[in-house]
């Protein structure tokens, strides 16, 4: 299972993808939106 995280500490597992929080403006991924620090880095 994949991991979704918010900076606020929330996480769930869902689908075969990886999402987690990075500093906004990081060049490591795409901002998901409507989250706290949610960035796609897979």
């Amino acid at each position: 299972d994949a991991e979704f995280r918010h900076d606020s500490g929330y996480e769930v597992h869902h689908q075969k993808l990886v999402f987690f929080a990075e500093d906004v403006g990081s060049n490591k991924g795409a901002i998901i939106g409507l989250m706290v620090g949610g960035v796609v880095i897979a």
């Epitope: 769930v12 795409a30 989250m35």
Partner: antibody, heavy 121, light 111 residues
């Protein structure tokens, strides 16, 4: 300024596929995920999923059970949403959208103008 | 999946009066003191527009007459003094979990 410009209206027969495009401009394309939301005539909003232009990774609403595919072309800053095995209930306006995160100090949303897809025999 | 339920389905309010729309989630959309609950306004023939995010924070350029409140599973959007340009359909949406989900919408009209 940020703009999302979608392709034009489509009429499809049941069982066919449709591919809607969303061309982004006014920002660094790979920085934000692009979401797709649809709205059947006179009905509410339904989130279909999103794709990351940075990596091409997508996350879909499982309601669509493998019928939806979201892709991107970084050379043209365009995201595509393809929906297959169309049925009459897929008749809707399809929107692409981009959202800021809560912690960016400002939170804005940007939407395409919508693409009407009509499924009719 | 989280189910969002709005009430009422429609609402007629006199100009200058208060309009109140309710939204209930089938489970909490809170985490660590943040409510992942957003409100949108949609006018006919237009895409939605984000009004309120994180339950209480105004989106960019949103007039002060729009405010949001609530936490956990119960939320409210208030228009403090209805203007003619506020005639629209309003939707709540949760962004705590995928799939994101919307309420069914509330149509606001002038009485």
């Amino acid at each position: 300024q940020v703009q999302l410009v979608q392709s034009g209206a489509e009429v499809k027969k049941p069982g066919a596929s449709v591919k809607v495009s969303c061309k982004a401009s006014g920002y660094t394309f790979t920085t934000y995920a692009i979401h797709w939301v649809r709205q059947a005539p006179g009905q509410g909003l339904e989130w279909m999923g999103f794709t990351s232009p940075y990596s091409g990774v997508s996350n879909y609403n499982q309601k669509f059970k493998g019928r939806v595919t979201m892709t991107r072309d970084t050379s043209t800053s365009t995201v595509y949403m393809e929906l297959s095995s169309l049925r009459s209930e897929d008749t809707a306006v399809y929107y692409c959208a981009r959202f800021d995160n809560y912690d960016q100090g400002y939170v804005r949303d940007y939407w395409g103008q919508g693409t009407l897809v009509t499924v009719s025999s | 999946d989280i189910v969002m339920t709005q009430s009422p389905d429609s609402l007629a309010v006199s100009l200058g009066e208060r309009a109140t729309i309710n939204c209930r989630a089938s489970e909490s959309v809170d985490n660590d003191r943040i409510s992942f609950l957003n409100w949108y306004q949609q006018k006919p023939g237009q895409p939605p527009k984000l009004l309120i995010y994180a339950a209480t924070k105004q989106g960019t350029g949103v007039p002060d007459r729009f405010s949001g409140s609530g936490s956990g599973t119960d939320f409210t959007l208030t228009i403090s003094s209805l203007q003619a340009e506020d005639v629209a359909v309003y939707y709540c949406q949760q962004s705590k979990e995928f799939p994101w989900s919307f309420g069914g919408g509330t149509k606001v009209e002038i009485k």
